[in-house]
């Protein structure tokens, strides 16, 4: 595997939230990452993530399959060969019903500072 | 080129468990997932689960969650499908694979050989 | 688990016809769909991804086509070395699951 440093992913946006599915917009660099390792977690359950993978040329990707009213965190992580970017984060609550498409809020989005180097 | 070779054929008990193995070769290993599909006689496709070895955490289809263990050894560029409290209709051929669209875009999807697994008392 | 649900389980048709096999997702799925064919004691083969994107070296008698939970596998004039059992896969959201297969059989 390669030492050298594996770019950071930039940052993440909920593009749109409808009360069974929402957009995820993304930075990163052109050209860094062979696919994106996205993981939707519902808040405050033990229940398995959704994980999906997206090619490294995407940044923006369709999460279907969620739940109305729900609080998930969805982070995402780029990855090349045998590195992993740090995880970034974002907390979003779908809406109620189809009345509250897209005005559902984004919380908060953050990154860490460090990559993970997988040996 | 990518090579996936399984482990040999099994003959097993009732209630038992087996572990297939699946080793890769000629082509990155950690950050690519590994599926394992298994095919009974006369029957179609099903999709067990699948793991990412450099993230390490498997996904698996409903249909197995408690009964199947999927593991990688990222040193051994090697992946694992146990599977436990066999039955007779666990009787089938399983193969480990590299799939178009989880964890993996490559051009061609690649297959091992494939291994069979007889439950019978 | 999503469910593929694939129709027809079986046809028969003769050899230039035009066939298609339906697969529907019990919820939207990110169009990460791929058609295979399997024939006896072989490993399955891709035929197309992205639901509508032609393998390399596939026949361009075979397309793929839908989005959202409805997509078809079309081949348009079919040829003996098509007589096969088609599969579709959902692989964009884990656990990814197949359709039950469709067989194509010689009428």
């Known amino acids: 595997a390669s030492t050298g440093e594996t770019p950071n992913l930039g940052e993440v946006v909920v593009a749109e939230v409808g009360w069974d599915a929402l957009k995820l917009n993304w930075t990163a660099p052109e050209g860094a990452y062979e696919y994106f390792f996205i993981q939707v977690q519902e808040a405050d359950t033990v229940e398995a993530a959704q994980n999906l993978t997206v090619p490294g040329g995407l940044r923006s990707t369709d999460l279907p399959g969620l739940k109305a009213a729900t609080h998930y965190t969805i982070t995402i992580r780029g990855v090349t060969q045998d590195f992993s970017t740090t995880p970034l984060s974002v907390e979003v609550l779908t809406a109620s019903g189809l009345n509250d498409i897209f005005e559902a809020q984004k919380i908060e989005w953050h990154e860490g500072t460090h990559h993970h180097h997988h040996h | 080129q990518v090579q996936l070779v399984q482990s040999g054929a099994e003959v097993k008990k009732p209630g038992s468990s087996v572990k297939v193995s699946c080793k890769a070769s000629g082509g990155t290993f950690s950050s690519y997932a590994i599926s394992w599909v298994r095919q009974a006689p006369g029957q179609g496709l099903e999709w067990m689960g699948g793991i990412i070895p450099i993230f390490g955490t498997a996904n698996y289809a409903q249909k197995f969650q408690g009964r199947v263990t999927i593991t990688a050894d990222k040193s051994t560029s090697t992946a694992y499908m146990e599977l436990s409290s066999l039955r007779s209709e666990d009787t089938a051929v399983y193969y480990c694979?590299?799939?178009?669209?989880?964890?993996?875009?490559?051009?061609?999807?690649?297959w091992g050989q494939g291994t069979t697994v007889t439950v019978s008392s | 688990d999503i469910q593929m649900t694939q129709s027809p389980s079986s046809l028969s048709a003769s050899v230039g016809d035009r066939v298609t096999i339906t697969c529907r997702a019990s919820q939207g799925i990110r169009n990460v769909l791929g058609w295979y064919q399997q024939k006896p004691g072989k490993a399955p083969k891709r035929l197309i991804y992205?639901?509508?994107s032609l393998q390399s070296g596939v026949p361009s008698r075979f397309s793929g086509g839908g989005s959202g939970t409805e997509f078809t596998l079309t081949i348009s004039s079919l040829q003996p070395e098509d007589f096969a059992t088609y599969y579709c896969l959902q692989n964009g959201l884990q656990p990814a699951t197949f359709g039950q297969g469709t067989k194509v059989e010689i009428k």
């Open positions: 992205d639901a509508s």
């Open positions: 694979a590299r799939l178009y669209g989880y964890a993996y875009y490559g051009a061609f999807d690649y």
